[in-house]
Interface confidence: low
């Protein structure tokens, strides 16, 4: 029941463009070149498409033509070689050139950037963005899809077709509104908090793969499916997990067509199968593709079936463990996180996998034991405190969040944060840290049972942004150690992390704390960044102060702003008042 | 970057012959190979014709017998005779030449085919 056409073609180019259609093909090429050359004006990208384009329309007409059969990374990167300004612009990328595939590509995975210097993107004028969206919708629509995979080197391909398509969408219903703002702003918001989400968890998905491999990412997609679909039998489950691993791994290796492709076709399969996968997509399958795709993986989790036997028969009491085990180690423990995961909705998948790992570790040392049953029949018992530690964390957490809101909660992480890894530039400590304290709103008012999910799930994929931020600019050794020892003890070392004995406060610099009327007219969430900025430098400078030290200073941070901003000379009233809000602090903290 | 220029176009009797030519200039020190292609209205493009800088020729074999491809390196023009013209020849006949691959096009010239 292979869901992938396995039929060798005599061209991969022209195969790929027929299977999905121009506009598709031409979209696709355009996201892996933007996130190859990340640095490229849009005017050079969208010529180099329009030649790729051009040459697999020659190659659909006649697929023995010459070149029509070779890769596509051969094609894509013989492209990519001509951009004359490589040198120049990418430094030792141009290296990549000299080398032949399938190295090149590697070479070019390799210097994909997850935090290249390029301007912020500042949103026009809505009547600007109508104007440029009526003249000429495509250029338009191919701008966003650039813009948007040259920032986020990982993101998910055909998920940004879907993305792009919402985008257009917004802008035909709203440019013809009556109030253009109030309908487009909301809708524009919306995608790039999705849009940010949606990259943040791709991102986890090609470091699950590139960094511990395919067993790694399978383990993941067999505890989350096998939530998602518990009435699934093991072999329907592990099916869609070997074909949703070949799409992750084509997207992720920057084999965009196929991996579009491929999606289709799961999707379709899954759509074809859904009396034996799940009664909750009905919906999602009368969808169009695009939009089908995305409906699948966001699907809610399908009821229990009801009666499920005690997982001890199987995994525990069963004579034959060992015996079935030693047969088939990674079918075995693949069934055993299938049947745990089907009946645990409520735990978050790195919960799972953690005592996946901890029954195979248990199983590795006894089955070599002399009285194996003996051995492993407490196993269970090992399982109470790994389910009890996340469960507590949250539950503090919850109540801390509920108590401070989210920006004091996001501070109070900063904090945290910053004594445990001070070593980490303030900007990344500040992303990483509003991300964190984003898992409050996020997944506090959900009931217990959706709790855990929500939360650790999430804490996953914001501290996989810390792990790719740092290992492109490695300063901590203890950030390093979290990030690379185990995939799935990435949050509990983290929260492990005590405060870093060893850093050497940081030199005060009056000119870190000084602030300029243009704070005035920054929006709230811009201003929040500032304080917490500040923040930041702070703990830097006094790893020691006290919380209550902190909010002291904090608040008349607050204050300050607030009274120069009011002011009728606010340059002035920043200059003299901030003079002495520095020489307050200092006195405050002791520096 | 290379300019095409297609001619010749025309209508034309069933069984008759006509004479399309392409005219390249530019940046033709690059041009590894010349083609044509034609796009009959609903169609999909389809491949005709291809000379390599070389000489070597190929065809699809819808046309194989009765169309020919030539090209005048002196005057960077490639012609493409064709003989026995059928009513499912009539399309838009476009030039393509390129380095590596056929990316650069002329804007194309109409062939009918009708009694």
């Known amino acids: 029941r292979g869901v992938f056409r396995r039929d060798a073609h005599k061209s991969e180019v022209a195969h790929r463009f027929k299977d999905l259609g121009e506009e598709n093909f031409k979209a696709l090429v355009l996201i892996a070149f933007a996130q190859y050359l990340q640095q490229c004006p849009f005017e050079d990208h969208v010529k180099l498409v329009n030649e790729v384009t051009e040459f697999a329309k020659t190659c659909v007409a006649d697929e023995s033509a010459e070149n029509c059969d070779k890769s596509l990374h051969t094609l894509f990167g013989d492209k990519l070689c001509t951009v004359a300004t490589l040198r120049e612009t990418y430094g030792e990328m141009a290296d990549c050139c000299a080398k032949q595939e399938p190295e090149r590509n590697e070479c070019f995975l390799q210097h994909k950037d997850d935090n290249p210097n390029l301007p912020r993107l500042v949103r026009p004028e809505v009547d600007v963005m109508c104007t440029a969206f009526h003249d000429n919708e495509e250029t338009f629509l191919k701008k966003y899809l650039y813009e948007i995979a040259r920032r986020h080197p990982y993101f998910y391909a055909p998920e940004l077709l879907f993305f792009a398509k919402r985008y257009k969408a917004a802008f035909t219903e709203c440019c013809q509104a009556a109030d253009k703002a109030a309908c487009l702003l909301p809708k524009l918001d919306e995608l790039r908090d999705e849009g940010k989400a949606s990259s943040a968890k791709q991102r986890l998905k090609c470091a699950s793969l590139q960094k511990f491999g395919e067993r790694a990412f399978k383990a993941w997609a067999v505890a989350r499916l096998s939530q998602r679909f518990p009435k699934a039998e093991f072999a329907e489950v592990s099916k869609l997990v070997t074909d949703l691993t070949k799409v992750h791994t084509e997207c992720c290796h920057g084999d965009l067509l196929e991996c579009a492709d491929d999606r289709a076709d799961l999707a379709k399969y899954i759509c074809e199968n859904q009396d034996s996968i799940s009664s909750k997509l009905k919906e999602c399958c009368e969808k169009p593709l695009l939009e089908k795709s995305h409906c699948i993986a966001e699907v809610e989790n399908d009821e229990m079936p009801a009666d499920l036997p005690s997982l001890a028969a199987d995994f525990v009491e069963s004579k034959d463990v060992c015996k079935n085990y030693a047969e088939a180690k990674d079918v075995f423990l693949g069934m055993f996180l299938y049947e745990y995961a089907r009946r645990h909705p409520d735990y978050s998948v790195v919960l799972l996998l953690r005592l996946a790992k901890t029954y195979e570790t248990t199983l590795e040392k006894c089955c070599a034991a002399a009285d194996p049953h003996e051995c492993y029949a407490k196993v269970f018992d090992e399982f109470k405190p790994l389910v009890e530690e996340p469960q507590n964390l949250i539950k503090q957490n919850c109540e801390l969040f509920e108590q401070l809101g989210e920006y004091k909660f996001q501070n109070a992480l900063l904090v945290r944060y910053t004594k445990k890894v001070p070593q980490v530039s303030t900007p990344t400590l500040v992303e990483v840290s509003r991300n964190l304290g984003k898992v409050g709103s996020k997944c506090c008012k959900h009931p217990e049972a959706k709790r855990m999910p929500c939360a650790e799930d999430y804490l996953s994929v914001v501290l996989n942004q810390l792990c790719v931020l740092h290992e492109k600019t490695p300063v901590s050794d203890r950030v390093t150690k979290c990030c690379t020892e185990s995939l799935v003890n990435r949050r509990p070392c983290f929260s492990a992390l005590e405060v870093d004995e060893t850093y050497v406060p940081k030199e005060f610099n009056a000119e870190t704390f000084t602030f300029h009327a243009d704070i005035c007219t920054l929006s709230e969430k811009e201003r929040q960044i500032k304080k917490q900025t500040a923040l930041v430098e702070l703990v830097k400078h006094k790893p020691k102060a006290t919380k209550e030290q902190l909010k002291a200073v904090m608040d008349d941070f607050a204050a300050f702003v607030e009274k120069c901003c009011k002011a009728d000379d606010k340059e002035t009233c920043f200059a003299e008042e901030g003079k002495k809000l520095v020489a307050a602090s200092q006195a405050a903290l002791g520096l | 970057q290379v300019q095409l220029v297609e001619s010749g176009g025309g209508l034309v009797q069933p069984g008759g012959s006509l004479r399309l030519s392409c005219a390249a200039s530019?940046?033709?020190?690059?041009?590894?190979?010349m083609a044509w292609y034609r796009q009959a209205p609903g169609q999909q493009r389809e491949f005709v014709a291809r000379?390599?800088?070389?000489?070597?020729?190929n065809y699809p074999d819808s046309v194989k017998g009765r169309f020919t491809i030539s090209r005048d390196n002196a005057k960077n023009t490639v012609y493409l005779q064709m003989n026995s013209l059928r009513a499912e020849d009539t399309a838009v006949y476009y030039c393509?030449?390129?380095?590596?691959?056929?990316?650069?096009w002329g804007q194309g010239t109409l062939v009918t085919v009708s009694s």
């Open positions: 393509a030449a390129g380095p590596v691959w056929e990316q650069f």
């Open positions: 530019g940046s033709i020190e690059s041009i590894n190979r």
């Open positions: 000379i390599s800088k070389g000489g070597s020729t």
